[in-house]
Every structure is written in structure tokens, then in C-alpha cells.
């Protein structure tokens, strides 16, 4: 006879699962802040930069009080997938000026990818309904000029920074209710 079966796998502690997700999010937030500061030092921003293809910020005045875990994770995953796509686009089409942000931009992409996988795992561990497969997104048009690429980088890093702050605040708030 084979070895006795091991103990049944303990059901995940949702607080511990959330904790490790928050840790990754905070870590990515720090990376994003550092990279945004680096970008500002090299190419000072003249006011706010927007990019129409970026997701709108998930948090509004009343939204944080009414958060539910499935909604937060689904929204966060969708937004971060969009930011991952934008970071990949920036690295590919951003032009020579943005090459000075390597290898940090590559590290950011890898960590963003890791957080997305962590969110996917969290959703399956907590037996939350899995979102449908993402529809193919229309390709992002290359920036019209070198300065266009820099403006896009400001918008992407600024938006990602705010989205990750929303995520940390939302996830920690939800943790207090578990």
C-alpha cells in the first residue's frame, strides 16, 4: 500500500490571503512611486496628463464604504490588466527617451504580472466567481512623438499609483470586516 494520505488541505484563511495580496500591492505601489519620481526628475511634467485608453479611477467619494470583496477583486484585476497592457506598450513603443527608465520599467511589468496572478489565485482560493475571459482589446496607437510617449508615461504611472492606493485602502478596509 502506498503512503497514508496527507492531512486534508486547510481551507485558506481569507485574512492571510488578503494580507499577502496587500503586501504585493504595497510593494508595487512603492516601485511605481519611485519610477514616477524618476520620470519626473528626467522629464518634468507640465500639469496633469491623461490617456483616454486608461481605466477611470475606481474609487469615488462614497464607493469605499460600500465595497464588497468580489467587486473589488474583479475591478482591480480588470484595471491592472489594462495597466499591464499600457506598460508593455510603453516599453515597446515609448521611444528612445523612455529607454532610460529600463530596467525599472521591466521590473514594474514583471511585478504587475505577479500581482495579477496573485489576484487570480486569491479569487479561486476564496471561491469567488471567475470573471469571463477578457475580450481582445483594440491595439494602442503608437505615440505621435517622443514627447507624446513621455506624457503617456506620466499618465500611466500616475494612474497606476492612484489605482494601487485605492487597492490597498479597499483591501485593508475589507479585511477589517472579515
Amino acid at each position: 500500500p502506498g503512503p497514508p494520505p496527507g492531512p486534508p488541505r486547510a481551507s485558506p484563511d481569507p485574512r492571510a490571503e488578503l494580507d499577502s495580496t496587500v503586501l504585493l500591492t504595497r510593494s508595487l505601489l512603492a516601485d511605481t512611486r519611485q519610477l514616477a519620481a524618476q520620470l519626473r526628475d528626467k522629464f518634468p511634467a507640465d500639469g496633469d496628463h491623461n490617456l483616454d485608453s486608461l481605466p477611470t479611477l475606481a474609487m469615488s467619494a462614497g464607493a469605499l464604504g460600500a465595497l464588497q470583496l468580489p467587486g473589488v477583486l474583479t475591478r482591480l484585476r480588470a484595471d491592472l490588466l489594462s495597466y499591464l497592457r499600457h506598460v508593455q506598450w510603453l516599453r515597446r513603443a515609448g521611444g528612445s527617451s523612455l529607454k532610460t527608465l529600463e530596467p525599472e520599467l521591466g521590473t514594474l511589468q514583471a511585478r504587475l504580472d505577479r500581482l495579477l496572478r496573485r489576484l487570480q489565485l486569491l479569487m479561486s482560493r476564496l471561491a469567488l466567481p471567475q470573471p469571463p475571459p477578457d475580450p481582445p482589446a483594440p491595439p494602442l496607437a503608437p505615440p505621435s512623438s517622443a514627447w507624446g510617449g513621455i506624457r503617456a508615461a506620466h499618465a500611466i504611472l500616475g494612474g497606476l499609483h492612484l489605482t494601487l492606493d485605492w487597492a490597498v485602502r479597499g483591501l485593508l478596509l475589507l479585511k477589517t470586516r472579515l
Epitope: 494580507d19 499577502s20 503586501l23 500591492t25 504595497r26 510593494s27 505601489l29 512603492a30 512611486r33 479611477l57 474609487m59 469615488s60 467619494a61 464607493a63 469605499l64 499609483h161 492612484l162 494601487l164 492606493d165 485605492w166 490597498v168 485602502r169 485593508l172 478596509l173 479585511k175 477589517t176
Partner: antibody, heavy 119, light 111 residues
Framework: EVQLVQSGAEVKKPGASVKISCKAS????????MDWVKQAPGQRLEWIGD????????IYNQKFTGRATLTVDKSASTAYMELSSLRSEDTAVYYC????????????WGQGTTVTVSS | DIVLTQSPASLALSPGERATLSCRAS??????????IHWYQQKPGQAPRLLIY???NLESGVPARFSGSGSGTDFTLTISSLEEEDFATYYC?????????FGQGTKLEIK
């Protein structure tokens, strides 16, 4: 110079409300959260909540939920805290403080606003 | 909520001496290399001032005689050689979870 300047001292009667302002200057207002902290005589500092000026999204310490309301006026780089249904235990110095996004440490503080609740 | 306990409640030392202030958390405030403890100094009639963030990072403009250490539940703020202006009350604060909470403070007095 990075500065947070708060409104002046207030004396209120029990049951009333108070609204304190905090004007930020010397930095991009939307790059940091604005937090509010209470310091009552002989008590430890107590976090009330924070607000993200970019979106106007507040979060609260459960102890203050329902009585504290945090708002911002982005165009004036000003944050506000309103505290309702005042009682004697609300007598304290209230501080606004600039909070690092996602980390809740406070690197710049207002000078404090003294609120006295007395009948 | 996480409770932070500071010791001693008060400490009397002379200028030039080394001060060691302790902060203990009711549960771990560290995760994978990050320790979510911050230290502040407060003088009478003034707002708190950030000295150390994330356990060991010196805030810009703070003298190098201040340092922070520790992980898990036990943290220390050290002032290597006390100056006259260091006599004040010191608070630790965590931001591991919501809500962030503060210790009750250690009052550092001149002997």
C-alpha cells in the same frame, strides 16, 4: 515650503457640529492622501480617517464612522473634517497630516485646531 | 485593532547620553521585509514630527543620531547622543492594518 495650515480654535456646545479646514501648499495636493488625527488631553493620538484628494474617496476609523465626514476642495487644495453630534470627549486638538499613499505614515502636519466642547 | 505599548513611560537622561525607546505591538506588524512602524517626536504645543518611517528609514532633514530598528512585534528608537532639543515625547505608530494606531508615548526628560 510644504505646509498645512488649519483653521482656528473652536468652542462648541454638546450636540453641535464643527468643520475644520486644512489648506495645503508647496506640493501637488493630489499626490498624497490627507489624514486626520485626534489628540485628546492625556490620551494617545487617534487616527480618524483619510481622504484621497484625487477622487474624494474617504475611509474612516470605525470609531468615527457616521460622525466624521472628510471632504476636499481640489481647486483650493483644501481638506475639511466635519465632526457632528459633539460631546465632551471630543474636546481635543485635531490635526490634518499628509499621508503617503498606501502606507499611512505622516510626514507633514498642520499646526492643529483646538476644539472645546462645553455647555 | 493592533495595540502598541511603549516603554518606559518616561526616561530621564543627560545631554550626550544614549536613549533607547521601545515599542511593542500586540501582533506582528512586519511582512516579507517590510515593517510598518513609524516614529514621531512631539514637543509641547507643537504637532508631531516624523522621524523614522517603515521601522528604519530616516525622514529627510532628521539628524543622523536618530535610528530605528526591529521587526515582528519589537521595535526600538535610538538617539545615539542626546542634544538639548531632543527632550520631548516620542510616539510609535503602525500602519500594518486599518486603523493605524499609536503608542501611548515615552516622555524623554532632562536629568
Amino acid at each position: 515650503e510644504v505646509q498645512l495650515v488649519q483653521s482656528g480654535a473652536e468652542v462648541k456646545k454638546p450636540g453641535a457640529s464643527v468643520k475644520i479646514s486644512c489648506k495645503a501648499s508647496g506640493y501637488t495636493f493630489t499626490d498624497y492622501n490627507m489624514d486626520w488625527v485626534k489628540q485628546a488631553p492625556g490620551q494617545r493620538l487617534e487616527w480618524i480617517g483619510d481622504i484621497n484628494p484625487h477622487s474624494g474617496g474617504p475611509i474612516y476609523n470605525q470609531k468615527f464612522t457616521g460622525r466624521a465626514t472628510l471632504t476636499v476642495d481640489k481647486s483650493a487644495s483644501t481638506a475639511y473634517m466635519e465632526l457632528s453630534s459633539l460631546r465632551s470627549e471630543d474636546t481635543a486638538v485635531y490635526y490634518c497630516a499628509r499621508g503617503e499613499l498606501g502606507h499611512w505614515y505622516f510626514d507633514v502636519w498642520g499646526q492643529g485646531t483646538t476644539v472645546t466642547v462645553s455647555s | 485593532d493592533i495595540v502598541l505599548t511603549q516603554s518606559p513611560a518616561s526616561l530621564a537622561l543627560s545631554p550626550g547620553e544614549r536613549a533607547t525607546l521601545s515599542c511593542r505591538a500586540s501582533k506582528s506588524v512586519s511582512t516579507s521585509g517590510y515593517s510598518y512602524i513609524h516614529w514621531y517626536q512631539q514637543k509641547p504645543g507643537q504637532a508631531p514630527r516624523l522621524l523614522i518611517y517603515l521601522a528604519s528609514n530616516l525622514e529627510s532633514g532628521v539628524p543622523a543620531r536618530f535610528s530605528g530598528s526591529g521587526s515582528g512585534t519589537d521595535f526600538t528608537l535610538t538617539i545615539s547622543s542626546l542634544e538639548e532639543e531632543d527632550f520631548a515625547t516620542y510616539y510609535c505608530q503602525h500602519s500594518r492594518d486599518l486603523p493605524p494606531t499609536f503608542g501611548q508615548g515615552t516622555k524623554l526628560e532632562i536629568k
